[in-house]
Interface confidence: low
């Protein structure tokens, strides 16, 4: 007996071939011997089966001795043995229809779980293997679960259902709702304007929700809500904003905040959360601000950084075009009685300069100049 696998909602064509290459009488029946369709001369006739409005054949092939049964919009309950009677012969075809669906919305928040459920006909024992967009393979039976979805899981999941050494492939598009980056860090000199951006890693026609940015300044004992906002059809409206700092928020995506000046008291880390309409849970992005200040007080040239720096970062003070005078894995370095000239304060990571501030030291009778 021939086995054919079909997908729920799809169309399947079951073949039936006569030895004579001409139009002769044929009938398709189900396992209960109920007629589905057949012919009467050149006319297609239909029986009383429940497939009535979804069954068809290709009249153009009858003259070649081919009498296919076409079933549209397949349902799981269409799984059956179909019998083609032609030339006193019977050809049996077993049709098995499978369906694969995501348990919930196919738009899921980062960190949530995805469950794929296989619908299969009674008596079948299929195996399922799914491949995620990042190439991860998951195997299972009637259900497959993936916990802690990551951004790389966004895209087309390809699932193969195997039964009777035949296979059928399903494709399910999953969108993981997340920010493009889980964390970002901004390095600024004192007084510079700061731009924070929170680009989303997905695009949808309508995007509605609300969000806020809580900020933990390094110098503060507790975190503070800097800004709260609404997002309606991808347009941003600010609800509340702290008086200090005087933040500005862009009216359009990507979510974009401007801090007029980087000051030591603002250095620290923030957490932007975005709650999307009709979704449980929130999207999160961490943002960090590191601020540098170079100063000269009397005979002391000091360079300091504030904010979340890694222990492997190096802070150096050097006179232009000379070797570093002082270089430490600390948040402050200084030089006593610095010689006149342009001094550079550098924050670097493995030789790569992240932040640089210049200060001009004048001969001792003058005051310093910051370019």
């Amino acid at each position: 007996k021939k086995v054919v696998l079909g997908k729920k909602g799809d169309t399947v064509e079951l073949t039936c071939t006569a030895s004579q290459k001409k139009s002769i009488q044929f009938h398709w029946k189900n396992s209960n011997q109920i007629k589905i369709l057949g012919n009467q001369g050149s006319f297609l006739t239909k029986g009383p089966s429940k497939l009535n409005d979804r069954a068809d054949s290709r009249r153009s092939l009858w003259d070649q001795g081919n009498f296919p049964l076409i079933i549209k919009n397949l349902k799981i309950e269409d799984s059956d043995t179909y019998i083609c009677e032609v030339e006193d012969q019977k050809e049996e075809v077993q049709l098995l229809v499978f369906g694969l669906t995501a348990n919930s919305d196919t738009h899921l928040l980062q960190g949530q779980s995805l469950t794929l459920t296989l619908e299969s006909p009674p008596g079948s024992s299929p195996s399922v293997q799914c491949r995620s967009p990042r190439g991860k393979n998951i195997q299972g039976g009637k259900t497959l679960s993936v916990s802690q979805l990551e951004l790389q899981d966004s895209g087309t999941w390809t699932c193969t259902v195997l039964q009777n050494q035949k296979k059928v492939e399903f494709k399910i598009d999953i969108v993981v709702l997340a920010f493009q980056k889980a964390s970002s860090i901004v390095y600024k000199k004192e007084g510079e304007q700061v731009e924070f951006s929170f680009p989303l890693a997905f695009t949808v026609e309508k995007l509605t929700g609300s969000g806020e940015l809580w900020w933990q300044a390094e110098r503060a004992s507790s975190s503070k809500s800097w800004i709260t906002f609404d997002l309606k059809n991808k347009e941003v409206s600010v609800k509340r904003v702290t008086q200090d700092p005087k933040l500005q928020m862009g009216k359009k995506l990507p979510l974009h905040l401007t801090l007029p000046q980087a000051l030591p008291q603002y250095a620290g880390s923030g957490n932007l959360t975005l709650a999307l309409e009709a979704k449980t849970g929130k999207l999160h992005q961490e943002v960090n601000l590191v601020v540098m200040r170079a100063t000269q007080l009397q005979k002391n040239l000091t360079c300091e950084v504030w904010g979340p720096t890694s222990p492997k970062l190096m802070l150096s003070l050097k006179l232009e075009n000379k070797e570093a005078k002082v270089s430490k894995r600390e948040k402050a370095v200084w030089v006593l009685n610095p010689e006149a000239g342009m001094w550079q304060c550098l924050l670097s990571d493995s030789g790569q300069v992240l932040l640089e501030s210049n200060i001009k030291v004048l001969p001792t009778w003058s005051t310093p100049v910051q370019p």
Partner: antibody, heavy 120, light 111 residues
Framework: EVQLVESGGGLVQPGRSLRLSCAAS????????MAWVRQAPGKGLEWVAT????????YYRDSVKGRFTISRDNSKNTLYLQMNSLRAEDTAVYYC?????????????WGQGTLVTVSS | DIQLTQSPSSLSASVGDRVTITCRAS??????????MQWYQQKPGKAPKLLIY???NLASGVPSRFSGSGSGTDFTLTISSLQPEDFATYYC?????????FGQGTKLEIK
């Protein structure tokens, strides 16, 4: 199929007014920002104005601020540009465009344009 | 306002040629790691058509011979193998700041 059809262009004297319309179909009009972009004869493209999906936010280029008003009627799927105190330099083909975005905002569908000639 | 300067202003090429058009912004059009730059194609008497958004993303229905690259202030539109229907005027456009601005256009003609 997304369609944007402008109308209302024509010859008008300097200092007079004109109202352009843009009939939208084939998409959910109330979900999208809309814009007017113009092109003077033989010249490049110039953004004129943008309106948010619900009409609450509008932006204009400086040279038309106070003279032009962008508006929309979501119940009629129609975008408007009311042009007052018209000047010779406003002569152009006026395109209505849909604004979409991924990170930046861009004009993903355009109408065929309507010509406005300001001349005495 | 952010000024966009395209080069060349006009260009003659043959079918099958690889063509590159550049667009330079007077200031960065990046926000964080995003480059807010678009490219459009316009044929005589017709409305512009979106080709590329966000510097390198290909708009729906646009052939893969078109590609965009660049970041910050310098951007490029490349047509890998010119087809007869590609002869048109090309514009870049930034949407980092209001007002949105376009380049002056590059006219691509048949050699």
């Amino acid at each position: 199929e997304v369609q944007l059809v402008e109308s209302g262009g024509g010859l008008v004297q300097p200092g007079r007014s004109l109202r352009l319309s843009c009939a939208a179909s084939g998409f959910t009009f109330s979900n999208y920002g809309m814009a007017w972009v113009r092109q003077a004869p033989g010249k490049g493209l110039e953004w004129v104005a943008t309106i948010s999906y619900d009409g609450s936010i509008t932006y204009y280029r400086d040279s038309v601020k106070g003279r032009f008003t962008i508006s929309r009627d979501n119940s009629k799927n129609t975008l408007y540009l009311q042009m007052n105190s018209l000047r010779a330099e406003d002569t152009a083909v006026y395109y209505c465009a849909r604004e979409e975005q991924y990170s930046s905002w861009y004009f993903d569908f355009w109408g065929q344009g309507t010509l406005v000639t300001v001349s005495s | 306002d952010i000024q966009l300067t395209q080069s060349p202003s006009s260009l003659s090429a043959s079918v099958g040629d690889r063509v590159t058009i550049t667009c330079r912004a007077s200031q960065s059009v990046s926000i964080s790691s995003h480059d807010l730059m678009q490219w459009y194609q316009q044929k005589p008497g017709k409305a512009p058509k979106l080709l590329i958004y966000d510097a390198f993303n290909l708009a729906s229905g646009v052939p893969s011979r078109f590609s965009g690259s660049g970041s910050g202030t310098d951007f490029t539109l490349t047509i890998s193998s010119l087809q007869p229907e590609d002869f048109a005027t090309y514009y870049c456009q930034q949407s980092k700041d209001d007002p949105y601005t376009f380049g002056q256009g590059t006219k691509l003609e048949i050699k």
